[in-house]
């Protein structure tokens, strides 16, 4: 599976985990059909993927949620892919927004985010949502990952 | 296009094909602007992409569909990316769900799925939907592919 | 960041730019947290990514838009990923469609497109939408990129 000792494959795919925390940062787990190629990428505190090597990474997240227009705030459901680099401000890399459904009790929708970004050693990426209680954690619905180019 | 004889590029992108079959598994074809890098990945029976080499793959699917809330079941439209490995359970890798539109005669919506997964030699991936008759087969709307890292 | 002098990494990620032009082709900029790996991929005229080397590329786009059913045409909002190759017809590679929301003044929705395609030297890819005035240009909402396998 190695490209060579100096250039091992680096990839991760983690699975959403329901959380009692009120934080807007989604929680993830190495469970089910997950991927964690080696220790050059790690899942930290169940909330962020952290890389040890600088380079270009394709980073993606998929979030499925169930919401209703009447029961939700006016604002849409927003999922954000964010970056934390040592000694720098946190940044938004990608965002997606979906207006709440009129279906009752709630209408399911899925969001997919993905892009190529340069990460520094020790950089972490995480996923924020406007309302984590609306996120669907059924098999395959919500996941998060990356691969090093 | 080779990374080297021992490590050729492996990638595929296939195009949706309307089918008279009542199966929930979508049908695909090597037509239009498709990709099939070599015989290390093949489209089998028009329904699954099968790989010959073990490794990490980024697998994706896009499904556009047109549905109406009144004419459809209560359940949302669900697209599933699934895995078949020799001697193992079939597995759901990824799913996305979208509630039906209230637009008439139907409202179009697009779903995108993608993630990194380890595949065994002989493993196949395929796409399931709740109602294949709702899928849009116009140019570029529905496609399926993978690339080996 | 090099795979070797003969095989450098090629990747780009550009950020949407509001435009006063009435063209349906989206405009992009190298701003914010953008990626432009080297001069083997370039952003031309703020509208297309052009590659110098033949090969397989994973190309993606994300478009967030805000529309209302009553204020829009009957037709859905469609985003298209298109290809221009020297001496050939332009082609649609990928499309996604979303019916307009009934939310007022408008309802936000996000579309993600992505797939693997063979590009010729000098080939350009660009993104078309049915109504560019509906596109959301807030941080992270709309972006476009590629990576060479």
């Amino acid at each position: 599976m190695q490209k060579g000792d100096q250039n091992p494959q680096i990839a991760a795919h983690v699975i959403s985990e329901a959380s009692s925390k009120t934080t807007s940062v989604l929680q993830w787990a190495e469970k089910g059909y997950y991927t964690m190629s080696n220790n050059l990428v790690t899942l930290e505190n169940g909330k962020q993927l952290t890389v040890k090597r600088q380079g270009l990474y394709y980073i993606y997240a998929q979030v499925t949620f169930c919401s209703n227009r009447e029961a939700s705030s006016q604002a849409p459901f927003i999922a954000s892919l964010c970056l934390k680099s040592p000694g720098r401000f946190e940044r938004i890399l990608l965002r997606a927004a979906n207006t709440h459904s009129s279906a009752k009790p709630c209408g399911q929708q899925s969001i997919h985010l993905g892009g190529v970004f340069e990460l520094q050693p020790g950089a972490s990426v995480f996923v924020n949502v406007t309302d984590p209680s609306q996120v669907s954690h059924g098999t395959g619905f919500t996941s998060f990952g990356l691969l090093k180019l | 296009m080779q990374k080297g004889d021992q490590n050729p590029q492996i990638a595929a992108h296939v195009i949706s094909e309307a089918s008279s079959k009542t199966t929930s598994v979508l049908q695909w074809a090597e037509k239009g602007y498709y990709t099939m890098s070599n015989n290390l990945v093949t489209l089998e029976n028009g329904k699954q992409l099968t790989v010959k080499r073990q490794g990490l793959y980024y697998i994706y699917a896009q499904v556009t569909f047109c549905s109406n809330r009144e004419a459809s079941s209560q359940a949302p439209f669900i697209a599933s990316l699934c895995l078949k490995s020799p001697g193992r359970f079939e597995r759901i890798l990824l799913r996305a769900a979208n509630t039906h539109s209230s637009a008439k005669p139907c409202g179009q919506q697009s779903i995108h799925l993608g993630g990194v997964f380890e595949l065994q030699p002989g493993a196949s991936v395929f796409v399931n939907v709740t109602d294949p008759s709702q899928v849009s087969h116009g140019t570029g709307f529905t496609s399926f592919g993978l690339l080996k890292l | 960041m090099q795979k070797g002098d003969q095989n450098p990494q090629i990747a780009a990620h550009v950020i949407s730019e509001a435009s006063s032009k009435t063209t349906s082709v989206l405009q992009w900029a190298e701003k914010g947290y953008y990626t432009m790996s080297n001069n083997l991929v370039t952003l031309e005229n703020g509208k297309q990514l052009t590659v110098k080397r033949q090969g397989l590329y994973y190309i993606y786009a994300q478009v967030t838009f805000c529309s209302n059913r009553e204020a829009s045409s009957q037709a859905p909002f469609i985003a298209s990923l298109c290809l221009k190759s020297p001496g050939r017809f332009e082609r649609i590679l990928l499309r996604a469609a979303n019916t307009h929301s009934s939310a007022k003044p408008c309802g936000q929705q996000s579309i993600h497109l992505g797939g693997v395609f063979e590009l010729q030297p000098g080939a350009s890819v660009f993104v078309n939408v049915t109504d560019p005035s509906q596109v959301s240009h807030g941080t992270g909402f709309t972006s476009f990129g590629l990576l060479k396998l």
Partner: nanobody, 123 residues
Framework: EVQLVESGGGLVQPGGSLRLSCAAS????????MGWFRQAPGKEREFVAV????????LYADSVKGRFTISADNSKNTAYLQMNSLKPEDTAVYYC????????????????WGQGTLVTVSS
């Protein structure tokens, strides 16, 4: 390790129905995937159906789709396979299996197997 005990096999006429049960013990039922394989005489073991006990998501082999239904009762730690419109080609030993994960790659999942129950479809 998960212990699995199947029941419900037997002889049935073509077009008839049977319901197989698989009782599991050994760890929390909702932490693994349950399903069925079958092996006909002289053939390889093949996948039939699977259910994710955490949320009820399921998949079926093409050959049984629309005829067989897999379900699970988490309170009883039991999975079921309802088989309708049975055909002679459904004749096989049916094995219940549970898939669990250790640490490391998700490919390193392990299967625990029941002893098998014979289903014969014949007139």
């Amino acid at each position: 390790e998960v212990q699995l005990v199947e029941s419900g096999g037997g002889l049935v006429q073509p077009g008839g129905s049977l319901r197989l049960s698989c009782a599991a013990s050994g760890r929390s039922f909702s932490t693994y995937t349950m399903g069925w394989f079958r092996q006909a005489p002289g053939k390889e073991r093949e996948f039939v159906a699977v259910i994710y006990t955490s949320d009820g998501a399921n998949l079926y082999a093409d050959s049984v789709k629309g005829r067989f239904t897999i379900s699970a009762d988490n309170s009883k730690n039991t999975a079921y396979l309802q088989m309708n419109s049975l055909k002679p080609e459904d004749t096989a030993v049916y094995y219940c299996a549970a898939e669990t994960y250790g640490s490391g790659s998700s490919l390193m999942s392990e299967y625990d197997w029941g002893q098998g129950t014979l289903v014969t479809v014949s007139s």
